[in-house]
């Protein structure tokens, strides 16, 4: 007996699509071996029509696909635009066609619905609108027009031209009588419900000379699109419901048991707590379409999602909807990275951001997730030398360590920095990482003076005190600029006296600026690192002023001013504002400066937001 399982019989009608799921034992060999769909011939052979290795027969070109779901031990064959020629016996299988690891499927395609016994068939999607046309003869032009629905053996009046509307159709039905030239009346039903399906009869006149017309209304639930994404990855649901609902509240919900659909996010400001920090609902286009991005996919995110439109912002009978079945692949290509990074007020964090290593040349971005309204993620920094004005001197995006990871360092932390941040690139849109920064009680490990003033032409020495816990780390000073932090020579001055209960392994490392010039003004960081992995940093702003008295300046901790919370920028600074991911396919930019950089198609990264992995301020 074959271990492959599937539907023995599939029945459909012309023009329709089928989605055939074949189940196999998900052993390692089975998951990775060839999957195929073939048609059995009269003489016993089986001719491949489509396979997982990319082969598609000319008979299936443009209308079929085969998707393997190794985590579930299933593969799905979708075939569209069916014709009666597609009727026959097929096999779905693994490996080589003739080798018995297969399952027999009988597909029968019958003639499509049309005019059957003078019955017009209307096939309409759930939530949409149908117009039932009812012709009549001249002698019934002035007579009552009506539409009935067959309920069991009895016709029940739905609407008539005297103003009656059945309560089940209140607010969503109308009867239109065409101008005198046309002998036709129409009944328009919107917000179609599944319960609206059935046999209808329209009638003009009430006597034996009345004109009657039968109609069969089929209300279709949308076939869910199968979506397969990696654990810790990202998914985008593109929802196009049509211009007729452009001004109606939109929602994305996840089906729980039975018919319940729990709102994940909607345009009325509702968001499920499980998606805090990892979801964006992108502003809708004029045609009413919108998209929802979810990052940091978890195992429990798998399931059926519906997007729709309804004034309540949630699924109701008659909402037009689109559906997806999301599978989350646990054999993820996306590495684990910390979901929480902790820092102390005045201290720093170093965040590691994964990206697709095949796309090392992609532009890297970091943005701050904001939950207000539908969620947005204004950019803070990118790898091309742009830093948001308010973050000058305390934020840097470094390409190190490379090979699939970049680093973002944020220092001078305040409680306002707590929140969710996204790592992005303009390359592979599946790689979006979400990390939460938490500000905890404690003191910064590195001690530096606050703002320092240097004198033109003189020498300035700035101390940085490293506690003994960093004895094995490389210690450095660098000068911050938009593109990173350029390393500077520094001197180890021996053990530091700035720490209580700290042995000889503490260190005082000084930065010396000889013959200070105006160009030396700016932000300086001292920090620790291990190879290409960065740890804590501390920042000092060095101002340069004219000479008042001779001599060099040696700055101590006691003399230093407190570091300012906000730095006032000189008026010449080019401020770039409102650089936000309002649509993850396009970074919305409002800049005074022309910027032709490729803003690319999505920028996804990911994080396992469900894990309890945490990362302290020192990164490693």
């Amino acid at each position: 007996k074959s271990p492959i399982f599937g539907p023995e019989e599939v029945n459909s009608v012309e023009g329709n699509s089928v989605s055939i799921t074949c189940y196999y034992p998900p052993t390692s060999v089975n998951r990775h071996t060839r999957k195929y769909w073939c048609r059995q011939g009269a003489r016993g052979g089986c001719i491949t029509l489509i396979s997982s290795e990319g082969y598609v027969s000319s008979k299936y070109a443009g209308r079929a696909n085969l998707t393997n779901f190794p985590e579930n031990g299933t593969f799905v064959v979708n075939i569209a635009q069916l014709s009666q020629d597609d009727s026959g016996r097929y096999k779905c299988g693994l490996g080589i066609n003739s080798r018995g690891l297969s399952f027999d499927v009988s597909l029968e395609v019958s003639q499509g619905p049309g005019l059957l016994n003078d019955t017009k068939v209307y096939t309409v999607d759930l939530g949409r609108t149908v117009t039932i046309n009812c012709p009549f003869k001249t002698e019934n032009a002035q007579k009552r027009k009506s539409l009935y629905k067959q309920i069991g053996l009895y016709p029940v009046l739905v609407i008539d031209s005297s103003g009656y509307v059945n309560p089940n159709y209140t607010g969503r039905i109308r009867l239109d009588i065409q101008g005198t030239g046309q002998l036709l009346f129409s009944v328009v039903i919107n917000q179609l419900r599944l319960s609206d399906a059935g046999q209808y009869l329209c009638q003009a006149g009430d006597d034996s000379n009345s004109n009657k017309k039968n109609a069969d209304l089929q209300v279709l639930k949308p076939e869910p699109e199968l979506v397969y994404e990696d654990l810790r990855g990202s998914v985008t649901f593109h929802c196009a419901l049509g211009p007729e609902v452009a001004n109606v509240a939109k929602f994305l919900c996840r089906q729980s048991s039975g018919e319940n659909c729990d709102v994940v996010v909607n345009t009325l400001g509702k968001r499920a707590p499980a998606f805090e920090g990892r979801i964006l609902l992108n502003p809708q286009d004029k045609d009413g379409s919108f998209s929802v991005v979810i990052t940091g996919l978890r195992k429990e995110d798998a399931g059926r999602y519906l997007c729709g439109a309804h004034s309540d912002g949630q699924l109701q009978e008659g909402s037009p909807i689109q559906a997806w079945q999301l599978f989350v692949n646990e054999e993820s290509t996306i590495p684990r990275s910390p979901t929480v990074v902790k820092g102390v007020a005045g201290g720093s964090v170093a965040v590691l951001c994964p990206y697709n290593r095949k796309e090392s040349k992609s532009i890297k971005y970091w943005c701050l997730w904001e939950g207000a309204q539908n969620g947005r993620c204004p950019l803070l920094v990118d790898s091309e030398g742009w830093v948001k004005a308010q973050y000058e001197g305390r934020l840097s995006l470094l390409e190190e360590p490379g090979n699939g990871t970049f680093t973002v360092i944020l220092n001078q932390l305040t409680s306002r920095d707590a929140g969710f941040y996204w790592c992005l690139t303009n390359g592979d849109t599946l790689w979006r990482t979400t990390v939460e920064i938490k500000i905890i009680e404690g003191e910064p490990n590195l001690k530096v003076p606050g703002n320092v003033t240097a004198v033109l032409g003189e020498t300035l020495k700035v101390p940085c005190h490293f506690p003994c816990k960093f004895s094995s780390y490389e210690k450095y000073w660098c000068k911050w600029n938009n593109t990173g932090c350029q390393a500077l020579p520094s001197q180890d001055e021996g053990p530091s006296k700035a720490f209580v209960n700290c042995d000889e392994n503490s260190r005082l490392v000084s930065l010396t600026l000889n013959l200070v010039t105006r160009a030396d003004e700016g932000w300086y960081w001292c920090g620790v690192k291990q190879g290409h992995f960065y740890g804590e940093t501390a920042a000092v702003y060095v101002a340069v002023e004219e000479r008042k008295a001779a001599g060099s300046r040696d700055v101590s901790l006691a003399k230093a001013d407190a570091a300012p919370d906000e730095k006032v920028l000189d008026s010449g600074f080019r401020e770039i504002e409102n650089k936000a991911i309002q649509d993850p396919r396009l970074f919305a930019e409002e800049k005074a400066v022309a910027d032709t950089r490729d803003q690319a198609d999505g920028s996804r990264a990911s994080v396992d937001s469900g894990s309890s992995e945490e990362q302290g301020g020192s990164s490693r």
């Epitope: 023995e8 055939i20 089929q218 639930k221 089906q255 018919e259």
Partner: nanobody, 127 residues
């Protein structure tokens, strides 16, 4: 809430036929699934047959031991599923349960894929 009521069970001779019915109250809608499971004396509940429908497409699934003998069908208008059982064997003796789900995309053999269950009807096949 969907309620399921099975009927048609009884005592028959080996080789005879029976037709089980499963009537669903409430709306089953334009997509969903109805399945038949059985539990023989001292055995685990096992899959027998299932019918899934997606709008105008239907998919029929059978357990190997019943292929060619049992046929699953559905009357859309009556909201009823049927299991036509021919060439019955003593090993078919069991309580037969009907299961339904308004919108399943799981493995139809998996009892966890169904939200609603009937109370069962007993089929006894004597030799």
């Amino acid at each position: 809430e969907v309620q399921l009521v099975e009927s048609g069970g009884g005592l028959v001779q080996a080789g005879d036929s029976l037709r089980l019915s499963c009537a669903a109250s409430g709306r089953t809608g334009s997509s969903g699934a109805m399945g038949w499971f059985r539990q023989g004396p001292g055995k685990e509940r096992e899959f027998v047959a299932a019918l899934m429908w997606r709008n105008t497409v239907t998919y029929k699934y059978y357990e190997d031991s019943v292929k060619g003998r049992f046929t699953i069908s559905r009357d859309n208008a009556k909201n009823t599923a049927y299991l036509q059982m021919n060439s019955l064997k003593p090993e078919d003796t069991a309580v037969y349960y009907c299961a339904a789900d308004p919108d399943t995309y799981g493995d139809p053999r998996n009892s966890g894929a169904y939200d609603y269950w009937g109370q069962g009807t007993l089929v006894t096949v004597s030799s």
